[in-house]
Interface confidence: medium
């Protein structure tokens, strides 16, 4: 009789990333008999939920059910029915919900409660919805990219999966930028830390890692823009704000009540003699850069070295993967190439920001104006954060790799989160097993 390949036993997992600006659902799959191997889990689908972040549903919680329906139904289609009941579903909420919780714990709990009730209605193994900490967000992002890059694998490869992958086992640092927070996570050269709050110890696949991480709440790109506007309107002589971070000719009316809605602008809040003001773009990168730098307090540091706002930052070490909005923004601006130097990026940002708004709208006709209008600010903010905030230099810039996906899986915290919660990252190196019918070579 002829040998038939046995059907592969596949497992699935679902993670919802409830971010400040939107929610995305990720479906992962892996061969069951290899779940302790490194690099076998991969993303099969991303479903972007139509609508804003869940924190925006605070006044209309009864709409959360319909909000999540399409993506949950998509998961039902993608995952075989026989697997539904054993497929875990996790929802992790990030900085948007951290901010809502700061305003009202009761309201944040109410949103999460309705989310949990909605997700419990599906035939999957729902494992709960929670607000993850900034430290977790940083750590899981670091685990994700290093898992996907094969950095935890003890097998040395004779080939390279992705352009920036090297055969050495030095881990990549992780730079994550969201709408409401940003995270930096890496293994510093010096294992002793001056700040225990920023220290994490992992044992993964038989190796110890001493990791530095910090999450800067309110320093995601959207909240940073609100901060900048709140800071700048303080010194405006009237209800016109001439803003160098928007293109010449751009105009937008902002409600003062919207500006002060977020806890991130509290430190700049003041009584203004108007209810609205108009942003008038003047498109000047250098001035925008100066304005952004005022958001970073670098005058105080109780450690040997700080990032900003008195937060410890050890000397940067090794290569870094910059993902989420770091990638989205730089990719839009066509600045993700490894060959583009920091000086060239700055030069291109100067050119981009100075382009008239009407010209920009014509050049990028398919892009929604809300986003299009903010790329000048976002690009400038990214440069400021990386160079002045985290102390990258023109030389170390080449160690930053702007990453969207690695081998088809999105870079971000969700995969690391699932790997941890499903116990798929063993502390010790698994014993090698004989080759099975489904072995990947």
């Amino acid at each position: 009789t002829q040998n038939k390949a046995l059907p592969e036993n596949i497992k699935y997992g679902i993670v919802l990333d409830a971010g400040s600006s939107h929610t995305s659902l990720y479906i992962y799959k892996w061969p069951a008999e290899k779940e302790n191997d490194t690099g076998v889990v991969h993303q099969v689908e991303e479903c972007r939920v139509k609508g804003p972040g869940i924190s925006k549903y605070v006044q209309k919680v009864n709409e959360i059910g319909i909000y999540l329906t399409d993506c949950m139904e998509r998961a039902r289609e993608v995952i075989p029915r026989s697997q539904h009941q054993e497929t875990p579903v996790y929802l992790g909420a990030t900085a948007g919900m951290r901010l809502l919780r700061m305003e009202s714990e009761e309201l944040a709990d109410r949103v999460l409660d309705v989310v949990e009730r909605s997700l419990s209605n599906y035939p999957f193994d729902f494992q709960g919805a929670r607000i993850i900490t900034g430290q977790e967000e940083g750590a899981y992002g670091w685990i994700t990219i290093n898992y996907l890059l094969g950095k935890f694998s003890q097998k040395t490869r004779w080939f390279s999966i992705v352009p920036y992958e090297t055969n050495n086992q030095e881990t990549f640092g992780a730079l994550d930028l969201g709408g409401a927070s940003t995270q930096i996570t890496f293994v510093p050269q010096n294992q002793t830390t001056e700040s225990p709050d920023n220290a994490l110890q992992f044992r993964l696949y038989g190796k110890d890692y001493n990791v530095y991480t910090h999450s800067f709440l309110c320093y995601g790109k959207d909240q940073a823009l609100w901060q900048k506007l709140a800071k700048d309107i303080q010194v405006a002589s009237n209800e016109i704000l001439r803003d160098p971070c928007f293109h010449p000719g751009y105009k937008k009316v902002v409600n003062v009540s919207d500006l002060y809605k977020t806890p991130c602008t509290k430190r700049f809040e003041m009584t203004l003699p108007f209810q609205q003001f108009e942003i008038q773009g003047i498109g000047n990168y250098q001035q925008c850069h100066q304005s952004v730098l005022e958001l970073f307090n670098t005058s105080y540091c109780p450690y040997s070295q700080c990032a900003f706002n008195g937060i410890f930052l050890p000397p940067l070490q090794g290569d870094f993967g910059a993902f989420s909005a770091f990638y989205f923004v730089m990719n839009f601006l066509n600045l993700t190439s490894e060959k583009v130097s920091q000086e060239k990026v700055t030069e291109m940002m100067k050119k981009f920001c100075s382009q008239p708004w009407e010209e920009i709208k014509t050049s990028y006709a398919g892009v929604k104006e809300k986003y299009l209008s903010e790329y000048c600010f976002s690009g400038t903010y990214i440069l400021s954060l990386l160079l002045q905030g985290y102390h990258f230099t023109a030389d170390s810039w080449e160690h930053i790799h702007f990453i969207g996906k690695i081998q088809g899986s999105d870079a971000g915290w969700t995969l690391g989160y699932m790997l941890n919660l499903t116990n798929m990252i063993p502390a010790e190196q698994p014993l090698s097993t004989p080759l099975s019918h489904s072995t990947y070579v």
Epitope: S21, P52, G53, K370, Y371
Partner: nanobody
Amino acid sequence: EVQLLESGGGLVQPGGSLRLSCAASGDIFSINYMSWYRQAPGNERELVAAITGRGNTNYADSVKGRFTISRDNSKNTVYLQMNSLRAEDTAVYYCNAWDYSDADEGPLREYDYWGQGTQVTVSS
């Protein structure tokens, strides 16, 4: 610009049925979420039922099993079939079309259209 016009409301006895229609003057095919809301005197407007572009539906607990939402994109119309009506269903019923555009960095609310409302009275 989408304009919504509701019809089908009226006076009905408890236990009776009504079918509300919401006709859109523009193309609703591109709009993902179509919903029915209602507002009784002195109460806040509440979501009754919603349907997505893919045909997935959601209902308020109070109407589950009694009301059915459907949409016919070829006719640019959304329907609400209301059976086993009760006195507490008495309200002005509004049709709503809402959607968010997708972009690289997260969605942006773009459409939020409301009809003028149609009165439903359940009384013996």
